[in-house]
């Protein structure tokens, strides 16, 4: 998930030098930007979140807000400061005319301004009839405490806290920030107002139908009786949680955001800050049958984004719409006809559908995992959720063709037991945003802060690409893929792993003069090869003959086309061992795969040779997939022969540590 993309409008207003009598003029040439929701009907013009630069103190925020008011008044405009943010993001919420935006963007400390916009509950009511709640099957793992060490915050509608399912389990906070309901005939009816939140609270921790029956919950009201809220209200809710966490630190916190709006830079930024403060955020992917990257908070990389599947493991269809999909989704979970508490009466049950219900499932699973292992970081939790998911059960034909490769084929499941997972080397695949088609376009895939980038690959549907390489950015390795002239664009694919005490570096060999191809190996003592990448400057990497072969007994070596520079990812970590596994097919084939054996984890995936008919390589769970152009276009010459190269690793150190714990 990337938080800098999205079908998102950005209006950049360059700052002028005349500073309108400001005491503190911003640095010369800096540019504050204005953002608004790309979904026009969801825009809320007239209310703006002014986000200040990261190190801005509360007093400076207040001073900047007052300055805006004073300057607006001099121009004859009324403004109202609705809220001053601190704790998560510095800034303020202001009600003002859009005419003042240019003025506001010139204020000192301003980073960007975002117009407020709507967010919506992501459920639809389903069966009308009253239902008897199911009980989870006895064969599913239920820790004795059922998530009791964890607190789950629910940002949603109001809830019926005296419902038998959730009575005594949910504490209703005094937080409320909701917009007026639409329409003139709307009558607030408690059962309607409480419907969405009550159901979700029941799915997370309900006595009968809940996933984490021991989890305690706190509810914040950010959605009105029609299931509608605002980005600003959600931000203030997230800030409330952060302040509560600081005032009274408790055990692990899970925040459930069963809502979605258009892509929002500020909402994603707030989620990032909260996640980096140790909070696990789980959100609905959205019910728009669309790319989840176009919605927030679904597109925030730090948030666990959940799509919805039904009992047959098919993506949920909701009329013409349905679950969102794409690279910003982390995994799917049950989201159709989900039985939970109904606000119609204190013993009623109802079923609802949507990605909200799917997210509530995952929040419940997360609560149970955190209760069993309270020290888990967000990265460790996400990797475990992925690891224990059911793999390759979703019918991908439901997704648009261009999204199938990007969408994770994972359905969340409770772990069979929380012990015995510690020895595993966990890895996941992270896809970048699409680079776009320009000649020099690049795409960047990043791992989470506490993950290691162990390999980097690239993929282009047209096959026109110039490979990929790992490079340092802000003190961390990232994976960058390069488009080629005439290409429709590329993706970068990072393999992100949990490898404690790792020391990784990239070794590069420039294009070789010799015809045998380019080679590079891990020459440092104790370093093992975890991934190979290749990058070339020529537009079309020709057929490479003789074919590149890895010399036997040299597993720590990357090999590639003689016109390409080759990059080896070399890591040292206690007990880390890796091996190379290859699967070559002499005849042309659209897809070649090679998988790591049980107990080994795929860290690297690449293709040999890197010629232009290879579309790219990527990891799907523990399998390395190499895709080539349609066989009919390549013919069955030796150029069609492709080898998939997997690097499989395991950590004896992690295994030993796990055995010692047991």
């Amino acid at each position: 998930q990337e938080d800098e993309d999205g079908d998102y409008e950005e209006l950049v207003l360059a700052l002028r030098s005349e500073e309108d009598g400001l005491a503190e003029a911003p640095e010369h040439g800096t540019t504050a930007t204005f953002h608004r929701c790309a979904k026009d009907p969801w825009r809320l013009p007239g209310t703006y979140v002014v986000v200040l630069k990261e190190e801005t103190h509360l007093s400076q925020s207040e001073r900047t807000a007052r300055r805006l008011q004073a300057q607006a008044a001099r121009r004859g405009y009324l403004t109202k400061i609705l809220h001053v943010f601190h704790g998560l993001l510095p800034g303020f919420l202001v009600k003002m005319s859009g005419d003042l935006l240019e003025l506001a963007l010139k204020l000192p400390h301003v980073d960007y301004i975002e117009e407020d916009s709507s967010v919506f509950a992501q459920s639809i009511p389903w069966n009308l009839e009253r239902i008897t709640p199911p009980r989870y099957r006895a064969d599913e793992y239920q820790p004795p405490d059922g998530g009791s060490l964890v607190e789950v915050y629910l940002l949603d509608t109001s809830i019926q806290s005296d419902h038998r399912e959730i009575e005594g389990r949910v504490m209703v906070t005094d937080f409320e920030n909701v917009p007026e309901e639409d329409g003139t005939r709307f009558h607030r009816q408690a059962s309607k107002c409480d419907s969405h939140g009550t159901h979700l609270a029941g799915v997370v921790s309900g006595r009968d139908a809940g996933v984490a029956k021991g989890a305690s919950m706190r509810s914040l009201r950010v959605l009105n009786c029609q299931g509608k809220g605002t980005v600003s209200g959600t931000l203030i809710g997230l800030e409330f949680i952060r302040k509560s966490q600081l005032v009274q630190p408790v055990g692990p916190l899970v925040v459930l955001l069963p809502l979605a709006g258009g892509y929002s830079r500020v909402l994603n930024a707030a989620c990032q800050r909260l996640a980096r403060a140790g909070v696990v955020l789980v959100t609905a992917a959205g019910n728009f049958r669309d790319d989840a990257c176009l919605y927030s908070p679904a597109s925030a990389p730090e948030v666990i984004t959940v799509g919805a599947t039904n009992a047959q493991d098919q993506p949920v269809t909701l009329g013409t719409l349905g679950t969102n999909f794409g690279r910003c989704v982390d995994l799917f979970a049950p989201g159709e006809d989900i039985i939970g508490a109904s606000s119609d009466c204190s013993t009623c049950f109802v079923s609802q559908s949507g990605t909200s219900q799917a997210a509530a499932h995952v929040a419940g699973i997360a609560a149970m995992m955190l209760s069993a292992e309270p020290e888990l970081t967000l990265a460790e939790l996400r990797q475990r959720l992925i690891h224990f998911s059911a793999k390759d059960v979703i019918n991908e034909a439901w997704f648009p063709e261009d999204q199938r490769v990007l969408t994770p084929n994972l359905v969340a499941a409770l772990p069979p037991s929380t012990h015995g997972a510690g020895w595993q080397l966990f890895c996941r695949t992270v896809w970048s945003a699409h680079s776009g088609p320009t000649r020099m376009a690049t795409a960047v895939a990043r791992c989470a802060p506490d993950e290691e980038l162990l390999s980097c690959s690239s993929f282009s549907r047209s096959g026109k690409r110039r490979g990929e390489r790992m490079e340092a950015q802000g003190g961390k390795l990232v994976c960058r893929a390069h488009n080629a002239f005439g290409g429709e664009g590329v993706y970068a694919i990072a393999r992100c792993c949990l490898l404690p005490q790792a020391n990784c570096s990239v070794h590069t060999a420039p294009p070789a003069e010799a015809s045998m191809g380019t080679r590079v190996h891990c020459h440092q003592q104790g370093h093992v090869l975890t991934g190979c990448s290749s990058h070339w400057e020529v537009e079309d990497l020709g057929t490479h003959k003789p074919p590149v072969l890895r010399p036997r007994g040299q597993p720590n070596q990357c090999v590639g086309h003689r016109e390409a520079s080759i990059h080896a990812s070399c890591c040292h970590a206690p007990g880390l061992e890796c091996k190379v596994k290859e699967h070559g097919i002499p005849a042309p084939q659209e897809q070649v795969t090679v998988a790591c054996e049980e107990g080994w984890t795929l860290t690297g995936c690449s293709a040999l040779p890197g010629t232009s008919h290879v579309l790219g390589a990527y990891a799907v769970d523990n399998t390395c997939v190499v895709r080539s152009r349609d066989v009919s276009t390549t013919g069955s010459t030796s150029e069609g022969a492709v080898t998939a190269v997997a690097i499989c690793c395991r950590s004896r150190h992690l295994a030993q540590a796990s055995q010692e714990l047991q």
Epitope: K39, D40, P41, R43, F120, A121, I124, P125, W126, N127, L128, D182, G183, T184, R185, F186, H187, K192, Q226, G227, K228, N287, F288, D290, L318, G319, T320, L321
Partner: antibody, heavy 122, light 110 residues
């Protein structure tokens, strides 16, 4: 499969009333906003009215405000259009149509009935 | 009087491309989602495009929509005889609090 079937059309004199019904099947009726749309002979489509999934909000085209009432019975999976003080210009085929998504009433309509004909003539 | 304006008719030979425009204002197209509907002779309308550019499942990718400012466009490529129909744009109008349809465009395959 998803189906909308209109009924209640017919020939009526100006000033009189008529009630149209639309029976929904194959989907969860109570989860969707519903619309009435009409089409006069040889003319284009004209939107008439919308009701939210839970009946909490209704909207009408100006020309029928105060004369027509849209309502629904979610327990019967049925949409209604009560038409009073009918005029010659109300003569049209009336379609009921399902809104694309709950709460996003501005999305448009994805499922249409076959229509029922209303003729207002003396 | 419709608030969305479309050309009364467009025509092209089989296999060719036709473009239908829909012009409105900031209170409708400018700030709302646009849908396109196809009405074959003697039948009910059918949804072709929603949210300005998205196709429901089952609608071929020969049909595509776009929106810019206060105008929307429907493109039909690889025109087929079965595409002969009336096409309507539609959107919510925030100032009227009403859904509005375009005047309609008749597509003829030569």
């Amino acid at each position: 499969q998803v189906q909308l079937v209109e009924s209640g059309g017919g020939v009526v004199q100006p000033g009189r009333s008529l009630r149209l019904s639309c029976a929904a099947s194959g989907f969860t009726f109570r989860s969707y906003g519903m619309h009435w749309v009409r089409q006069a002979p040889g003319k284009g489509l004209e939107w008439v009215a919308l009701i939210w999934h839970d009946g909490s909000n209704t909207y009408y085209v100006d020309s029928v405000k105060g004369r027509f009432t849209i309502s629904r019975d979610n327990s019967k999976n049925t949409l209604y259009l009560q038409m009073n003080s009918l005029r010659a210009e109300d003569t049209a085929v009336y379609y009921c149509a399902r809104g694309i998504a709950v709460a996003y009433y501005y999305y448009g309509m994805d499922v249409w009935g076959q229509g029922t004909t209303v003729t207002v003539s003396s | 009087q419709s608030v969305l304006t479309q050309p009364p008719s467009v025509s092209a030979a089989p296999g060719q491309k036709v473009t239908i425009s829909c012009s409105g204002s900031s209170s409708n197209i400018g700030n709302n989602f646009v849908s396109w509907y196809q009405q074959l002779p003697g039948t009910a309308p059918k949804l072709l495009i929603y949210d300005s550019n998205k196709r429901p499942s089952g609608i071929p990718d020969r049909f595509s929509g776009s929106k810019s400012g206060t105008s929307a466009t429907l493109d039909i490529t690889g025109l087929q005889t079965g595409d002969e129909a009336d096409y309507y744009c539609g959107t919510w109008d925030s100032s009227l609090s009403a859904y509005v349809f375009g005047t309609g465009t008749k597509v003829t395959v030569l």
